[in-house]
Interface confidence: medium
């Protein structure tokens, strides 16, 4: 068995979360991508995917998330803009694959947000907070529902019409039963 | 196997910038980070930031986030370190280095296996 | 920032002694830790990268072990080329952050 592995990433309140997922070039190019959270004792869950098939760097948004497939260099860029407290826990890239179950890319991603304030200097806040104004050409994408016994992912919105409006925006600010890492300073 | 050629030494005032690259040759470039690196004399080394060029989103470390700017070019593999407001004290030998990551992967990141040869930056008036 | 404490910051031995040098991370950095060797007028050197991994093409008198907080750079059987100083340093986390360094020389 593959043993789980995780990378930390400690970052303050309104900073970027901005990591890559790397797949096998020639078998998972055009598959569809998705990022999960992992919350102590449940199934992922699915809060972003990209379109199927996934189209070569177009960026999908949902929410404060946004996913761009580089088909050429075999990697998922993932974006969590805004960070909140509230995002702390463990998240992962899968792959999905139907009929099969999705195929997860390692390594798993622990992510730590802490207060900050206005001004606090971090890794990527002054310098980078204009990248990240959401580019006029994202679009949002469904995910499929997956029921298994290892994998259960959220069902897609009622309608495709909604997926434009406000509503349909994952919205993290929620999240309580998450496992959480001490930081110290 | 990958290569790194930096620019050549340079002498600045206090208070001016100076600009260094690093060009990549052999090898993939683009989704790789390219780290900065500093020794100052007799300190030790000091990381200053990194890029992914592909993602084109550097980070920076905290001491030097209001005065360094790194870039990176695709189309030229190379990568750009720029330091402004230039001060006695930033005298130093200035290394770009290669490493994995960072960001989920099956391979992580593998410490910064790659490096230029180092530019010697002097600041005196 | 995660700070990183190695110890000792300078070391004297002699050419065929077993030399260890450790570095504390200010919290848990999992197994994320290079060791660099660096020489006067040459750009440093990858040695040991997830901790305990040898880099290819460095000799196997070096090890590396450790993790979370506490890490060791071992040379089994030191070597003339081996004095230099040897630098830690941690991707946990952005900024990546070096140890201060522990300078090797001759006895």
């Known amino acids: 068995a593959t043993k789980l592995t995780e990378e930390k990433y400690e970052l303050k309140e309104g900073q970027t979360l901005d990591v890559k997922c790397d797949y096998t070039l020639e078998k998972f190019a055009s598959s569809q991508k998705a990022w999960q959270i992992i919350r102590d004792g449940e199934m992922p869950k699915t809060l972003a995917c990209t379109e199927r098939p996934s189209k070569n760097s177009h960026p999908v948004q949902v929410g404060r998330i946004i996913l761009e497939d580089y088909h050429d260099h075999g990697l998922l860029r993932v974006r969590m803009v805004n960070l909140q407290v509230e995002d702390s826990g463990l998240y992962q890239c899968v792959i999905y694959q139907p009929p099969k179950e999705p195929h997860m890319l390692f390594d798993r991603i622990r992510l730590v947000v802490t207060k900050g304030f206005s001004g606090t200097p971090g890794s990527n806040e002054n310098s980078t907070q204009n990248v990240y104004k959401i580019p006029p050409t994202t679009t949002k994408a469904l995910c499929p529902l997956y029921t298994s016994p290892r994998t259960v992912t959220q069902a897609p919105p009622k309608s495709t019409a909604d997926v434009s409006t406000p509503d349909s925006e994952i919205n993290l600010t929620n999240v309580t039963d998450i496992i959480r890492v001490p930081v110290f300073n | 196997q990958v290569q790194l050629v930096q620019s050549g030494a340079e002498v600045k005032r206090p208070g001016s910038s100076v600009k260094v690259s690093c060009k990549a040759s052999g090898g993939t470039f683009s989704i790789y980070v390219i780290s900065w690196v500093r020794q100052a004399p007799g300190q030790g080394l000091e990381w200053m930031g990194g890029i992914i060029p592909l993602f084109g989103t550097p980070n920076y470390a905290q001491q030097f986030q209001d005065r360094v700017t790194i870039t990176a070019d695709e189309s030229t593999r190379t990568a750009y370190m720029e330091l402004s407001s230039l001060r006695s004290e930033d005298t130093a030998v200035y290394y770009c280095a290669r490493g994995h990551g960072p960001g989920s992967s099956h391979y992580s990141y593998y410490g910064l296996d790659v490096w230029g040869q180092g530019t010697t930056v002097t600041v005196s008036s | 920032d995660i700070q990183m404490t190695q110890s000792p910051t300078s070391l004297s031995a002699s050419v065929g002694d077993r030399v260890t040098i450790t570095c504390r991370a200010s919290q848990g950095i999992s197994s994320w830790l290079a060791w660099y060797q660096h020489k006067p007028g040459k750009a440093p050197k990858l040695l040991i990268y997830a901790a305990s991994s040898l880099q290819s093409g460095v000799p196997s008198r070096f090890s590396g072990s450790g993790s979370g907080t506490d890490f060791t750079l071992t040379i089994s059987s030191l070597q003339p080329e081996d004095f230099a100083t040897y630098y830690c340093?941690?991707?946990?986390?952005?900024?990546?952050?070096f140890g201060q360094g522990t300078k090797l020389e001759i006895k």
């Open positions: 340093q941690q991707y946990n986390s952005y900024p990546y952050t």
